[in-house]
Amino acid sequence: YTSTAQPCPYPMAPPNGHVSPVQAKYILKDSFSIFCETGYELLQGHLPLKSFTAVCQKDGSWDRPMPACSIVDCGPPDDLPSGRVEYITGPGVTTYKAVIQYSCEETFYTMKVNDGKYVCEADGFWTSSKGEKSLPVCEPVCGLSARTTGGRIYGGQKAKPGDFPWQVLILGGTTAAGALLYDNWVLTAAHAVYEQKHDASALDIRMGTLKRLSPHYTQAWSEAVFIHEGYTHDAGFDNDIALIKLNNKVVINSNITPICLPRKEAESFMRTDDIGTASGWGLTQRGFLARNLMYVDIPIVDHQKCTAAYEKPPYPRGSVTANMLCAGLESGGKDSCRGDSGGALVFLDSETERWFVGGIVSWGSMNCGEAGQYGVYTKVINYIPWIENIISDF
C-alpha cells in the first residue's frame, strides 16, 4: 500500500510582499518564505514577525497561515518637552515615509540638534534628516530682558517685571542670590551656599518675582550643590563660584529666563569703564534688605587699581586675584552689598543683543559703596570649562 502526499495550494503573496522561492508546485517538505517590500513589515494578526517560512505538510496544507505585509507604523511621536509636534503628511499619519515637524515654544525656546523634521523610516523609527532617532532639544533662550541699557550710571533703581528674569532668590540660613542657567541650574557664589553643600534640600530657591517677601513666586528646590574645588571657606574669595542643580526644570517665560554664559568674545564687552548691571535684594543705603529687587549700573574698574585698593589693611595681600573683576565708582555710592551675594553682574553683548553673566557678586569693603573701594566679583569667563563640565556630567 502506498500513498502520495498532496501538493500544497500555490502560495499567493500578500499585497506588498513576494514569495521565494517561486516553484511550479510545492509538495511535502517544500517551503516558501514571504518578504515584504521596503516600508512594509510581516504581521500575523497585529504582531510583527522577524521572518516567515511555511512548510508543506503531508495532508497538502501549509503549516502556517499566510501573514500580511503591513505598512510600517512608527507610532505616535514622543512629546517634545517645551515644544510640540505637527503632522505634515496627513492627520495623525505615522506610517512609512510620513513626515512630522517638531518645533519649540516660540520666543523662549530654541531648537538644538537639528531642524526638527523627522520621517518615518522602514525600521519603524522617526528619523531626522541627519539620521538621528533621538528627539531634538528645546533649549531655553538666554539673556532676554525687558530692559535696554542706556549706558549711563545711576543709583539703585527698582527693577520692573522682566528686567532681570534670571534673578534667583536663595534662602537657607542667609539671604543670597543667584542667576538661572538653562532651565535647571543656578549659578551663584560658593560662599553663599557653602553651609548647604551637604544639605542641598535646605535651600529655598525662588524666582519669577520682584518682591522679596511676595507669596507669588516660582518655587524651585535644589538637588545638588557643586562648589568649586579651588574655593577655601574663610580663606579669601578666590574661586568663589558654585552651581546648584535644580530637581526639576523650570518653565521659561518673560519673568523667568536664564542668563547667557559669556562667549569667547565677551571680554570685549567687559573692558575698563564698560558698564555692568548688578541686581539683588541686598542691603540698601538705609541698611535694610531691599523689599523690591534693585539694580545698579556700574563701570568695570581697572584691575591694577582694584588690586591696589585692597592691598592695604585690613585686607591681606593678594586679596584680589586674576579670577576676580571689580566694578564701582571711585567716588563710591554705587555698589552691591550683603544679601546680593551670588547674584549676577551682567553685560549686554551688542552683537547678539543678549545679556550675559560676567561676574558673580562675591565680596567688597566692609562698608558697601565706600569711596576708593570697589565691589569684587568672580570673573565668570575664567570658569566656563568648569561650568560646562559640571553641567554636562550631571
Epitope: L47, S70, D73, C74, G75, V85, E86, G92, T94
Partner: antibody, heavy 117, light 111 residues
Framework: QVQLQQSGAELAKPGASVKMSCKAS????????MHWIKQRPGQGLEWVGY????????DFNQKFKDKATLTADKSSTTAYMQLISLTSEDSTVYYC??????????WGQGTTLTVSS | DIVLTQSPASLGVSLGQRATISCRAS??????????IHWYQQKPGQPPKLLIK???NLESGVPARFSGGGSGTDFTLNIHPVEAEDTATYYC?????????FGGGTKLEIR
C-alpha cells in the same frame, strides 16, 4: 492653549443651505486638521470630514460628500462648513474639533441647526 | 468602514465601585507600534472630552481612576473608584483609518 469658538444657533428652511463657522484662537498651529462631527439628540457621534486649513485639502465621510462643503480662511484661522439641501435629518448639533495627533484634541462648543418650515 | 460596538449601552454603578465599558472593533486597529483607539467623555450640553488616547495613555489632567487597555479588536475603559462627577456618556473612537468612526456610546449612571 487652543480655543475653538463656533457660530451661534441656526434656523433654516427645508431645501435651504447654511454655513457655520469655527474660529481657532490661542496657540494655533501651521499643520492641523479641523474636523466636523455631527451628533443627533440622544445619539452617537458621526464624523463628517476634515480640512487642513494650511493646504485646503479635504476628506469626507462618503455619507456627507454631497451634503457638506468644508472651507477655511487661513488668515483669520476660521473654518467653515456649509450644508446644502437641508432636511429635518440635518437638524442637530455640529461640533468642530481640532486634531493635532491621532485624536481630537480641542472641541468647539457646538452649533445647533434647526431645519423647520 | 470600521464598526465600533460598545457595550453595555447603559450602566449603573454604585459610588466607589468599578465601571467597565467594552468596545469591539470590526477589524484590527493596532499596528506593531501602537493602537489607535481613544476614549471620550461627554456630559449633557458639553462637547466630548478626551480621556484616554492610544488605548491606554491617560490625557493630561484626567484623574488616574480612569484607565484603558486592549489591542487588536477588543478594548476596555475602566473607572475605579467611580465618583458622582463621572456621570456621563462614554465613546470609543478609532483613528486607524478614514472614515473615523465612534462607538454608539455607554451612558454611565452613578447609583
Amino acid at each position: 492653549q487652543v480655543q475653538l469658538q463656533q457660530s451661534g444657533a441656526e434656523l433654516a428652511k427645508p431645501g435651504a443651505s447654511v454655513k457655520m463657522s469655527c474660529k481657532a484662537s490661542g496657540n494655533t498651529f501651521t499643520n492641523y486638521w479641523m474636523h466636523w462631527i455631527k451628533q443627533r439628540p440622544g445619539q452617537g457621534l458621526e464624523w463628517v470630514g476634515y480640512i487642513n486649513p494650511n493646504t485646503g485639502y479635504t476628506d469626507f465621510n462618503q455619507k456627507f460628500k454631497d451634503k457638506a462643503t468644508l472651507t477655511a480662511d487661513k488668515s483669520s484661522t476660521t473654518a467653515y462648513m456649509q450644508l446644502i439641501s437641508l432636511t429635518s435629518e440635518d437638524s442637530t448639533v455640529y461640533y468642530c474639533t481640532l486634531q493635532l495627533g491621532r485624536n481630537f484634541d480641542y472641541w468647539g462648543q457646538g452649533t445647533t441647526l434647526t431645519v423647520s418650515s | 468602514d470600521i464598526v465600533l460596538t460598545q457595550s453595555p449601552a447603559s450602566l449603573g454603578v454604585s459610588l466607589g465601585q468599578r465601571a467597565t465599558i467594552s468596545c469591539r472593533a470590526s477589524q484590527s486597529v493596532s499596528s506593531s507600534r501602537s493602537t489607535y483607539i481613544h476614549w471620550y467623555q461627554q456630559k449633557p450640553g458639553q462637547p466630548p472630552k478626551l480621556l484616554i488616547k492610544y488605548s491606554s495613555n491617560l490625557e493630561s489632567g484626567v484623574p488616574a481612576r480612569f484607565s484603558g487597555g486592549g489591542s487588536g479588536t477588543d478594548f476596555t475603559l475602566n473607572i475605579h473608584p467611580v465618583e458622582a462627577e463621572d456621570t456621563a456618556t462614554y465613546y470609543c473612537h478609532q483613528s486607524w483609518e478614514i472614515p473615523y468612526t465612534f462607538g454608539g456610546g455607554t451612558k454611565l449612571e452613578i447609583r
